[in-house]
Amino acid sequence: LPAQVAFTPYAPEPGSTCRLREYYDQTAQMCCSKCSPGQHAKVFCTKTSDTVCDTCRPGWYCALSKQEGCRLCAPLRKCRPGFGVARPGTETSDVVCKPCAPGTFSNTTSSTDICRPHQICNVVAIPGNASMDAVCTSTSPTRSMAPGAVHLPQPVSTRSQHTQPTPEPSTAPSTSFLLPMGPSPPAEGSTGD
């Protein structure tokens, strides 16, 4: 006769361990289903009912994994102006931000936005920096606009932002000196990629 398949939750035989994708719940004293990576235990198992799993809600990730699944969902980090997403968040990892390199910017606080290139102007009214697009005067920039219009960048918060570090070749770290005034555009230098 084939061995009887035990369905979770079940009490393990003395001295035996729970199977793959299961964990021993100390409270229930039963073998219960583990939640898949990126899911969390919405309801823990009891002697009569198995673990109820759920994914973290959109914009959140699993910040603390335990054997029974995710114990803590947390909101994804948002990259602040002057920084863009270097590594997107996943079900089990947070967003990583990186400074916008010279010639690129981000003026949002976002968990998805990457650094975008400054628009290229025929005549620059205000140079772009890490947290602001370039402002063009007169004739149209690369991104299509009405002739003769002045393109104003999307306003950022009035708060001052991080002064941006300057990227340099990866043989040696770059140096960024922080002035007591508001941020200035990063010095144009080798991007070191």
């Epitope: 990583v96 708060r159 932002q161 990227p167 770290p173 140096t175 070191g192």
Partner: antibody, heavy 125, light 107 residues
Framework: QVQLQQSGPGLVKPSQTLSLTCAIS??????????WNWIRQSPSRGLEWLGR?????????DYTVSVKSRITINPDTSKNQFSLQLNSVTPEDTAVYYC???????????????WGQGTLVTVSS | DIQMTQSPSSLSASVGDRVTITCQAS??????LNWYQQKPGKAPKLLIY???NLETGVPSRFSGSGSGTDFTFTINSLQPEDFATYFC?????????FGQGTRLEIK
Amino acid sequence: QVQLQQSGPGLVKPSQTLSLTCAISGDSVSSDSSAWNWIRQSPSRGLEWLGRTYYRSKWYNDYTVSVKSRITINPDTSKNQFSLQLNSVTPEDTAVYYCAREDGVGGTKDYFDYWGQGTLVTVSS
Amino acid sequence: DIQMTQSPSSLSASVGDRVTITCQASQDISNYLNWYQQKPGKAPKLLIYDASNLETGVPSRFSGSGSGTDFTFTINSLQPEDFATYFCQQYDNLPITFGQGTRLEIK
């Protein structure tokens, strides 16, 4: 579990160079999600952030303006550590120096979550 | 630089008390503020990040609130191990700056 172990002399003569090292275990100095900081603490100035180094496809350094002309923070990928050099020290630089890991550079949730044990550095002849 | 002003600089309280510490930034820092606890001879320890989020493993008697320039840190029902110095820290703008600290002593 991340651990930071500091080493370096506790006594430096005025005008000389203060050099400290912070050895990392449980993370990598070239991690794409951490930054490596030096912070000092003295009774007169409280906690003072000095600077940081971090890697995001390339290395970045940020320094505070008050020590900008005297400070260097360098990563050492072969030994998985980073160092602080502070030149031309004066008795004003006497403090407990801490290395610290920063999580979340450039984003929300940006904080110092792991610290070294601290090194009291006295500048005196 | 952004100045962080903590008050009071020291306070005395008893086990079981509720204590509140305030931190004021010299300009708007949104909610980019963290709170740390430091015991003598030890490094600071993160308690609260982004003004109101409790760090994993930190007891729920600790809490934080505020946004913009005014922030509050509260300990409900003080425990003997809570007597220490507490610091706020802003990361809205470089250089990162700390408050001068609030020393919490046993009454």
